[in-house]
């Protein structure tokens, strides 16, 4: 849970309230017990170009 | 140029607390998460405790929860570990680490160590 | 837990010698694998962190190498200021972490 008074992640990351600060959630592939990737579950992933039309 | 200086270490008997004292200088200290990792005479490392940058998240090894307590006062640039209920299995050399500001990834700089002794 | 075991426990060498300690893990790390140093009645310092990247002051010839479960850390050419223990620590499982027994560097 993000802490109160802290400004929202940006699409694609999580707080992590271990850090106290938003974290990539590209990472939790890597490690995914990492605090944060309980709220990357929830989120949809940063947008990205689609490479055909 | 980073240090880490812990205090408060003593002989203590079964069952009796101490609290543990860190003091940081040389960086800025509120940013950093910090842990506590001691050392039994002649033994291995073992990771005690760890708290967030803020103070609001805390981690403990299972051989410690529910007795000693970590906290941290950004004003005096002190991180804490309150010890109570003491064990002969407590008795070590006890570190307090400043960690990266990735996620768990190391741990970089080290005090010099405290010692704990517990004892009748 | 994580497990993480060192070998050997010990090992004798002469300055000069290459020198190599291994760490194995119970289950895969990625590379969230450290190598610390400790001489006796000091702290730990850190060599190496993310299984190969030297940490700032640490000289060249300490590397790491390693991913998922087995992991060495090298010293090309023992300098007498070498003699110590060495220990490995994961930072996968968060926040247990977990440190590897140790290996003791003796001189031969």
């Known amino acids: 849970e993000q802490a109160p008074g802290t400004a929202p992640c940006s699409r694609g990351s999580s707080w992590s309230a271990d850090l106290d600060k938003c974290m990539d959630c590209a990472s939790c592939r890597a490690r995914p017990k990492s605090d944060f990737c309980l709220g990357c579950a929830a989120a949809p992933p940063a947008p990205f170009r689609l490479l055909w039309p | 140029e980073v240090q880490l200086l812990e205090s408060g270490g003593g002989l203590v008997q079964p069952g009796g607390s101490l609290r543990l004292s860190c003091a940081a200088s040389?960086?800025?200290?509120?940013?950093?998460?910090m842990m506590w990792v001691r050392q039994a005479p002649g033994k291995g490392l073992e990771w005690v405790s760890y708290i967030s940058p803020s103070g609001g998240s805390t981690h403990y090894a299972d051989s410690v929860k529910g007795r000693f307590t970590i906290s941290r006062d950004n004003s005096k640039n002190t991180l804490y570990l309150q010890m109570n209920s003491l064990r002969a299995e407590d008795t070590a050399v006890y570190y307090c680490?400043?960690?990266?500001?990735?996620?768990?990834?190391?741990?970089?700089?080290w005090g010099q160590g405290t010692l704990v002794t517990v004892s009748s | 837990d994580i497990q993480m075991t060192q070998s050997p426990s010990s090992l004798s060498a002469s300055v000069g010698d290459r020198v190599t300690i291994t760490c194995r893990a119970s289950?895969?790390?990625?590379?969230?694998l450290n190598w610390y140093q400790q001489k006796p009645g000091k702290a730990p310092k850190l060599l190496i962190y993310a299984a190969s990247s030297l940490q700032s002051g640490v000289p060249s010839r300490f590397s790491g190498s390693g991913s998922g479960t087995d992991f060495t850390l090298t010293i090309s050419s023992l300098q007498p200021e070498d003699f110590a223990t060495y220990y490995c620590q994961q930072s996968y499982s968060t926040p247990g972490i977990t440190f590897g027994q140790g290996t003791k560097v003796e001189i031969k």
């Open positions: 289950q895969s790390i990625s590379s969230y």
């Open positions: 680490a400043r960690g990266g500001d990735t996620y768990f990834d190391y741990f970089d700089y």
């Open positions: 040389g960086f800025t200290f509120s940013p950093y998460p």
